[in-house]
């Protein structure tokens, strides 16, 4: 498909002027090959007739541009003194005019209406209100107001001064009379149709004294603006309709066949499924206009997109609206990330979040989307330091691997986890990306005591349990602070017995400890990682109190009396619910995670096969 | 809520120096970043400085840039102004502001001097510098 764009149709009158916006990719290439605009010939040639490199065709001498600019990646064509000889198809493309990377425009040029003496012209945008203006006599004053439209050679009416309205108008017309000193009246159509444009006379008085008055309706449906994204970027829609409509409920719908404009958002909480994660209405300013950004474009995003203003928070005849027309740029710069996420209960996600490499500064996020209003993504952590206080020895964003990319990593993992999570940054925009973290049933790969107390001046050492699968990977313990987790020397202790059916490959690996200080309190991970790359990991918060009994403390996972909310495994380790604790001090003291078996596949989801977006909670 | 309580205001003579501090009460832990602003007489509130709240990155009106310093205690909750090399065009009222942490889009892309930024304001203390 070519990832030229441009519109599709152009409607304009004899004698006017267009401007013709192309888009392309604003690859290094591109930005410096020649743009040209061509007419298609009957036997599918097209012969240029205008091009940046200074060729003009004799038909276009003195009455049309083109004009490049790289930065935006677009060109555009500007053609003046039109006639309807213009009329016809043409492309406006890249390189060589066969060569395919071109977009086929339909330019349609129409006579200009033939209108009668004396006839004022209004031209009001579809869904607008109008208000024709009527002169008359003194004579006519206490006489009979009317509207009429012309359909065909009949006049018909519309509305008169004694009540009567045209069933075609009903709920939205009415007639104005003005105070004694102005000879005027007025009739005011609100939401207009298309249907409503024509010719239309307006009379004072029915015998030949009457006064008369010729009008001239033009609905103008909206020219789309044209948006050019890229694939997995993200689009922002800016609708302005206007302080009449502040208090009408907003929507934006997408046009399907013929007229259907199906319903992506709406300001009475209707969302369409096939954006669920990654839509977000921002709420409207005092005049009533909003804006909605759809993340993570998809190829069948592509498309026209409308919002308006109606009660029923759906298209309807008269509502005002506004057009886009979106193309999805699939030679994207934006890379593949996954879009979908997936951990255990009790187990943790990296989540790696692309950024315009450009902005290597720019400030990082991570929010929440929340679905159950239509704006909100609140946020959870940033890259300067803050932590949502509910995240606090969980959370954590890092500038790594960098380069284009920031790690999220998420442990402790619960149920009420799953959902959809935003990357985005305080600079471009368009980087804005979505991921889903989905809870799947498994186990947590690696051991650790659940929460654990150490002796002020005392020896501590906490182990962690990898299995085989980590045999690869680098294996460390670090603390947590709210800019990251400061990485801790650590033991390795040789293989693990945690696992069944895990070989000498399997690895315990310890934290020590020494001469604890009030200053060790707080969370400790476990985690496994290749090079920048971040896998899964695994949170104990240890608590810090005085001395009762001297000694060293060597916390394993294994305690003869369970718990009672812990069931004890066969093989004598005691598994329990790892919830996220909100004050870890208020829990029994080196509560265990363990599992019987080696979950080769337990809390690295596997990839499902309909999708090759997938990652699983361990590294890459 | 979060409450904001400004002090340190009063005369002072050109050249010399004045702290403001601002106290934080209430749901703190709410707190994304905090800001001064001052309004002269008879003119709009404009932006002095700004501070986020976990980092301490900080940001400054080219006005006062190299005469003033925002600074921050967590463990307090307080943010202060180090005025110094003071101006008779300095003189206005001081209001210490406060935002919560971005829950709308709109809200990732604001900038610290904007005063839209700012959810919470404290009442304001009056900064006189005489010639």
């Known amino acids: 498909k070519s990832p030229i764009f441009g519109p599709e149709e152009v409607n304009s009158v004899e004698g006017n002027s267009v401007s013709i916006t192309c888009y392309y990719p604003p690859t290094s290439v591109n930005r410096h090959t020649r743009k040209y605009w061509c007419r298609q010939g009957a036997r599918g040639g097209c012969i240029t007739l205008i091009s940046s490199e200074g060729y003009v065709s004799s038909k276009y001498a003195g009455r049309a541009n083109l004009t490049n600019f790289p930065e935006n990646g677009t060109f555009v064509v500007n053609i003046a003194q039109l006639s309807q000889d213009d009329s016809g198809r043409y492309k406006c493309g890249l390189g060589i005019n066969s060569r395919g990377l071109s977009f086929d425009v339909s330019l349609e040029v129409s006579q200009g209406p033939g209108l009668l003496n004396d006839t004022k012209v209004y031209t009001v945008d579809l869904g607008r209100t109008v208000t024709i203006n009527c002169p008359f006599k003194t004579e006519n004053a206490q006489k009979r107001k009317s509207l009429y439209k012309q359909i065909g050679l009949y006049p018909v009416l519309v509305i008169d001064s004694s009540g009567y309205v045209n069933p075609n108008y009903t709920g939205r017309i009415r007639l104005d009379i003005q105070g004694t000193g102005q000879l005027l009246f007025s009739v005011v159509i609100n939401q207009l149709r298309l249907s409503d444009a024509g010719q239309y006379l307006c009379q004072a008085g029915d015998d030949s004294n009457s006064n008369k008055k010729n009008a001239d309706l033009q609905v103008l449906k909206p020219e789309p603006e044209l948006v050019y994204e890229d694939l997995r970027g993200s689009v922002t829609f800016h609708c302005a309709l206007g302080p009449e409509v502040a208090n009408v409920a907003k929507f934006l719908c997408r046009q399907s066949s013929g007229e259907n404009c199906d319903v992506v958002v709406n300001t009475l909480g209707k969302r369409a499924p096939a954006f669920e994660g990654r839509i977000l209405l921002n709420p409207q300013d005092k005049d009533g206009s909003f804006s909605v950004v759809i993340t993570g474009l998809r190829k069948e995003d592509a498309g026209r997109y409308l919002c308006g203003a109606h009660s029923d928070g759906q298209l309807q005849e008269g509502s005002p609206i506004q057009a886009w027309q979106l193309f999805v740029n699939e030679e994207s710069t934006i890379p593949r990330s996954p879009t979908v996420v997936k951990g255990v209960a009790g187990g943790s996600v990296a989540v790696l979040c692309p950024y315009n490499r450009k902005e290597s500064k720019s400030i990082k996020y991570w929010c929440l989307w929340e679905g159950a209003q239509n704006g909100r993504c609140p946020l959870l952590v940033d890259s300067e330091g803050w932590v949502k206080a509910q995240y606090e020895g969980r959370l954590s964003l890092l500038e790594e691997p960098g380069n284009g990319t920031f790690t999220v990593i998420l442990n402790q993992l619960t149920s009420r986890d799953a959902g959809f999570y935003w990357c985005l940054t305080n600079g471009d925009t368009l980087w804005r990306t979505t991921v889903e973290i989905k809870i799947i049933e498994g186990e947590p790969n690696l051991k650790v005591p659940g929460n654990v107390t150490a002796v002020l001046g005392e020896t501590l050492k906490v182990p962690c349990h990898f299995p085989c699968k980590f045999s690869s990977y680098e294996k460390y313990w670090c603390k947590w602070n709210n800019t990251g987790c400061q990485a801790l020397p650590s033991q390795d202790e040789g293989p693990s017995k945690a696992f069944v059916n895990c070989d000498e490959n399997s690895r315990l690996v310890s934290l020590t400890l020494n001469l604890v200080t009030r200053a060790d309190e707080g969370w400790y991970w476990c985690g496994v990682k290749q090079g920048h790359f971040y896998g899964e990991t695994a949170a104990v918060y240890v608590a810090v109190e005085e001395r009762k009994a001297a000694g060293s403390r060597d916390v394993s996972l294994a305690k003869a009396d369970a718990a009672p909310d812990e069931k004890v495994l066969d093989s004598g380790f005691r598994e329990i619910e790892n919830k996220a604790i909100q004050d870890p001090r208020l829990f029994a003291e080196e509560k265990a995670v363990a599992d019987t078996r080696d979950q080769a596949d337990g809390s690295r989801a596997s990839v499902d096969s309909g999708s090759s977006e997938e990652q699983g909670g361990s590294s890459r | 809520q979060v409450q904001l309580v400004e002090s340190g205001g009063g005369l002072v003579q050109a050249g010399g120096s004045l702290r403001l501090s601002c106290a934080a009460s209430g749901r703190t832990s709410s707190i994304y970043g905090m800001g001064w602003f001052r309004q002269a007489p008879g003119k709009e509130r404009e932006f002095v400085a700004a501070?986020?709240?976990?980092?301490?990155?900080?940001y400054h009106a080219d006005s006062v840039k190299g005469r003033f310093t925002i600074s921050r205690d967590n463990a307090k909750n307080m943010v202060y102004l180090q005025m110094d090399k003071m101006k008779p065009g300095d003189t206005a009222v001081y209001y210490c502001?406060?935002?919560?942490?971005?829950?709308?889009?709109?809200?990732?892309?604001?900038?610290?001097?904007?005063?839209?930024?700012?959810?919470?304001w404290g009442q304001g203390t009056l900064v006189t510098v005489s010639s």
């Open positions: 501070i986020s709240w976990s980092a301490g990155r900080t």
């Open positions: 502001a406060a935002r919560r942490a971005p829950e709308l889009l709109s809200d990732y892309t604001q900038k610290p001097e904007e005063i839209g930024t700012y959810h919470y």
